[in-house]
Interface confidence: medium
């Protein structure tokens, strides 16, 4: 008799999920000498232990603590780049500017980037058919709780000037409900962080508006200021030129505002 399986609204676990996590871990630890001590089999066991046999709507940050411990990593606290709704450009930037780091440049972020996973209560099976959707099903699902946990820790580690890349093409440039707006902003430590500098990335070719005056950016400024952190905002009018100038800052076309 086929066992009844809960149908969730979101896509199921990414195919070959265990193999993918393990392979990513091996690759990361080979590339990053400071993480060579990490035992990837133990990392996978801890990752698996966080959600296997547990109800996928009842996951807690506590479930991920063994994984967090194994993935403990020190990145330069003054070189952190946060992002919201503009992941690709943020990653392109840190690939060129190798001394700055997004969450996905850390081991734990790298392992989970773009993956989905969940299990089932009381069975050791991974659910490849469907997983809970944050809105339609539940917020305490394995993927959401993972990103909330690692994002909080990443923000807590930040110091000095923290940069955040925001998508100027969206109706809410700063969205209080995004991971940045709901987790990272509130976990920056005022005793360590002097300034949050927002880079608002323009989408349109001829868009010369000052998006730093957008009401949602003013809302971000207000939240940050109330936390005794200074706020700064810059428009990046030409993201293509921005990347080009990061690659080659001495280029004559990079002497003007980007």
């Amino acid at each position: 008799v086929p066992r009844w399986r809960q149908q969730w609204s979101g896509p199921g676990t990414t195919k070959r999920f265990p193999e993918t996590v393990l392979a990513r871990c091996v690759k990361y630890t080979e590339i990053h000498p400071e993480m060579r001590h990490v035992d990837c089999q133990s990392v996978w066991d801890a990752f698996k232990g966080a959600f296997i046999s547990k109800h996928p709507c009842n996951i807690t940050e506590e479930d991920y603590q063994p994984l967090m411990k194994l993935g403990t990593q020190t990145v330069p606290c003054n070189k952190i780049l946060l992002w919201s709704r503009i992941k690709d450009l943020a990653h392109q930037f840190t690939q060129v500017q190798r001394d700055m780091f997004t969450l996905e440049d850390t081991l734990l972020g790298y392992l989970a980037d773009d993956l989905t996973w969940c299990g089932e209560f009381n069975t050791s099976k991974i659910n490849y058919q469907s997983c809970p959707d944050w809105r339609k099903d539940c917020s305490n699902n394995p993927v959401s709780v993972f990103w909330k946990t690692v994002s909080r820790r990443f923000a807590e580690a930040a110091c000095d000037v923290v940069h955040v890349m925001l998508n100027g093409s969206r109706s809410k440039i700063f969205d209080k409900n995004s991971t940045f707006g709901s987790v990272e902003v509130h976990n920056l430590q005022p005793e360590k962080v002097q300034t949050l500098e927002a880079w608002v990335i323009h989408g349109g070719r001829e868009d010369s508006r000052d998006l730093c005056q957008d009401p949602t950016i003013k809302e971000l400024e207000s939240i940050i200021s109330k936390r005794n952190i200074q706020f700064s905002c810059k428009n990046i009018y030409r993201p293509d030129k921005f990347l080009q100038c990061v690659k080659n800052p001495e280029d004559s076309s990079c002497t003007s505002e980007i």
Partner: nanobody
């Protein structure tokens, strides 16, 4: 790490000139973008001028444009200068040298700071 030591400050009359120097030791310095900041009593620290890694790009605050010139020592590349002409009482401040590992106008991020040198301009 990089250590920065400023010199050349002092007391001058309005209209006079001063040349500040910032000498760096430690890691290879030629790969650093540099800047001069200043902080007047009771005011926030502000950027005065910046220069890119090779010295090819320079930037100035509006208040000093045409009067101040930033440069890097082309031979050693481990010293950056701020030539200050036509000094005004409003230029009175502690001047700080700063360095960072990459140059982009958008960023406030400077990794290394000197202790500062006092510049006083009397009227």
């Amino acid at each position: 790490d990089v250590q920065l030591v400023e010199s050349g400050g002092g007391l001058v009359q309005a209209g006079d000139s001063l040349r500040l120097s910032c000498a760096a030791s430690g890691r290879t310095f030629s790969s650093y973008a540099m800047a001069w900041f200043r902080q007047a009593p009771g005011k926030e620290r502000e950027i005065v001028s910046s220069i890119s890694t090779s010295g090819g790009i320079t930037d100035y605050a509006d208040s000093v444009k045409g009067r101040f010139t930033i440069s890097k020592d082309s031979a050693k590349m481990n010293t950056v200068y701020l030539q200050m002409n036509s000094l005004e009482p409003e230029d009175t401040a502690v001047y700080y040298c700063a360095a960072r590992t990459w140059y982009l106008r958008t960023s406030l991020q400077y990794d290394y700071w000197g202790q500062g040198t006092q510049v006083t301009v009397s009227s």
